[in-house]
């Protein structure tokens, strides 16, 4: 952890990334014993709080401004030097979001991955954006940073992500930011959840009253499995978003969870898949497709009494 | 298409205050932030500032700090430029001009101050 | 602050010829450099953004380039509607600084 050389290493918690008004804790990890040390500011747009102090063990830093963006360098208290302090530390980069409109962020080809498959996250916005940062959420690193490509008055940048494996599965959000403030990020992207299937056993997935129903008669599909999923995940071919449910145990030792569709309108292929509160990203192989097929007059949608799942919230815990 | 138009000419005494506007139309108001660009009769183009129409914060360059201030009426998509205590210095021909690279330039106000 | 030194400060050109004004900068700007056109009476008109991205709109006889510190506008077939006062502009790092200008006229 130490930086090595005499130099400290600085290090921000939670993250880099920090909202306006939201706090960070800069820490200055240097030599055992030696906790204090001084913070300063790179560029030209000084905060007036560092000069001439001296911290121990960590500064907490905000609420944050706008001004707070840019990068940051310590030096660990060293008594018995000449100058009584280290080598500066490694640069570390604060970034303020919140300063414009958010961009989207889209999953090609989709935001569910079997382990090795490789994902492109596209951030856009009609913001003309000069960089685009990705950062998946609970990592304290700097984000990934691409320059935006302008076409048709958008601008974009393709995130590889891949190829997949369990670290790389969570929340995703991207930013942007102009030129000449290039570390005043805008609000986040709606959060994208990238999950990635196939590290568990299948579950099954059958209808009641059965996979072929007269138009208007009550749908249920059940998904269930000998696994003690705490989730299952109902998906629908065609539809982005999936519905999820709380698994429940059953008399027999099966864990099951039954989602109804309400009256039947028109027919789907349906998919379910299981996963644990522990790693709500990582999800089971995937059931057996299920069609449903609905005979007599289909309309065009299917209501759903069943609360559909949001964009995301996947990731995180159901409580 | 993406427009900025600016209001009219103004003549005012030294000490008195004048208010521009900058109503742009065409695209999404808060996408972009806005620049103000001064033009002094025979002299070339300066900066003053820019205001994130986003977060309605300004940043204002040395030159212009105190007597200036930029606002913003986003409801209307109009951009504001203020100056107080004017002095003759401040003749000039000002512009508001959008996002980062100064894409899309009003017409210009051309302020006089003269007792 | 950026010091962006433009040259020639003025020049006379005939109908077709060539024309190259450029801008220096004092420090490194990336390739954060605008062209502006201005004429009387007119708003200012954007050619180039990221020293050499053509505004849709502007006629392709425009171009620009460079990086760093050394950029340059050009006009492969000078016609008569192109003479005004053409100023770049870094947008790199706040405060924006403009050239000093290039005032061309026709020959």
């Known amino acids: 952890l130490m930086g090595g050389q005499d130099k400290p290493f600085l290090s921000a918690r939670p993250s880099t990334v920090v909202p306006r008004g939201g706090h960070v804790a800069l820490q200055c990890h240097y030599r055992r014993g030696f906790n204090n040390f001084m913070l300063y500011k790179e560029d030209r747009s000084h905060v007036p709080i560092f000069h001439g102090r001296i911290f121990q063990e960590s500064f907490i830093m905000g609420p944050v401004t706008p001004a707070h963006a840019g990068t940051y360098r310590c030096r660990g208290s060293r008594p018995h030097s000449l100058t009584g302090w280290s080598a500066p530390s490694n640069p570390l980069v604060i970034m303020v979001t919140g300063n414009h409109r958010k961009p989207s962020l889209l999953a090609h080809p989709g935001p569910l991955l079997k382990s090795g498959e490789t994902v492109i996250l596209q951030c856009w916005s009609d913001v003309m954006f000069e960089h685009f940062f990705l950062h998946r959420e609970g990592i304290s690193e700097d984000p990934s940073r691409l320059v935006g490509q302008i076409h048709d008055g958008v601008s974009k940048a393709n995130f590889s992500i891949g190829p997949m494996m369990l670290a790389l599965a969570g929340t995703y959000r991207c930013y942007g930011s102009v030129p000449h403030s290039p570390y005043q990020l805008s609000a986040p992207s709606d959060p994208l959840d990238i999950v990635i299937t196939g590290l568990y056993e299948k579950p099954s997935l059958s209808a009641q009253p059965g996979p072929t129903v007269q138009a208007g008669e009550n749908v249920t599909l059940s998904c269930s499995s000998w696994s003690s999923y705490d989730i299952y995940h109902l998906s629908r071919e065609g539809e982005a978003h999936e519905r999820r449910l709380r698994a429940v145990p059953k008399v027999n030792r099966t864990f099951q969870a039954d989602f109804p569709l309400g009256p039947a309108t028109h027919g789907g292929t349906y998919r379910c898949f299981g996963s644990f509160r522990a790693l709500p990203c990582v999800w089971s192989n995937s059931s057996d497709p299920l069609l449903v097929s609905v005979t007599g007059n289909p309309s065009s949608s299917w209501p759903s009494p069943t609360e559909p799942s949001s964009k995301s919230g996947i990731c995180r815990h159901l409580h | 298409q993406i427009q900025l138009v600016q209001s009219g000419p103004e003549l005012k005494n030294p000490g008195e205050t004048v208010k521009i506007s900058c109503k742009a139309s065409g695209y999404i108001f808060t996408n972009y932030g806005m620049n103000w660009v001064k033009q002094a009769p025979g002299k070339g183009l300066k900066w003053m500032g820019w205001i994130n129409t986003y977060t309605g914060e300004p940043t204002y360059a040395d030159d212009f700090k105190g007597r200036f201030a930029f606002s913003l009426e986003t409801s209307a998509s109009t951009a504001y430029l203020q100056i107080n205590n004017l002095k003759n210095e401040d003749t000039a021909t000002y512009f508001c001009?959008?996002?980062?690279?100064?894409?899309?330039w009003g017409q210009g106000t051309l302020v006089t101050v003269s007792t | 602050d950026i010091k962006m030194t433009q040259s020639p400060s003025s020049m006379y050109a005939s109908l077709g010829e060539r024309v190259t004004i450029t801008c220096k900068a004092s420090?490194?700007?990336?390739?954060?450099l605008s062209w502006f056109q201005l004429k009387p009476g007119k708003s200012p008109k954007t050619l180039i953004y990221r020293a050499n991205r053509l505004v849709d709109g502007v006629p392709s006889r425009f171009s620009g380039s460079g990086s760093g510190q050394d950029f340059s506008l050009t006009i492969s077939s000078l016609e008569c509607e192109d003479m005004g006062i053409y100023y770049c502009?870094?947008?790199?790092?706040?405060?924006?600084?403009f050239g000093g200008g290039t005032t061309l006229e026709i020959k």
């Open positions: 502009l870094q947008y790199d790092e706040l405060p924006y600084t």
């Open positions: 420090q490194d700007i990336n390739s954060y």
């Open positions: 001009a959008h996002g980062p690279w100064l894409a899309y």
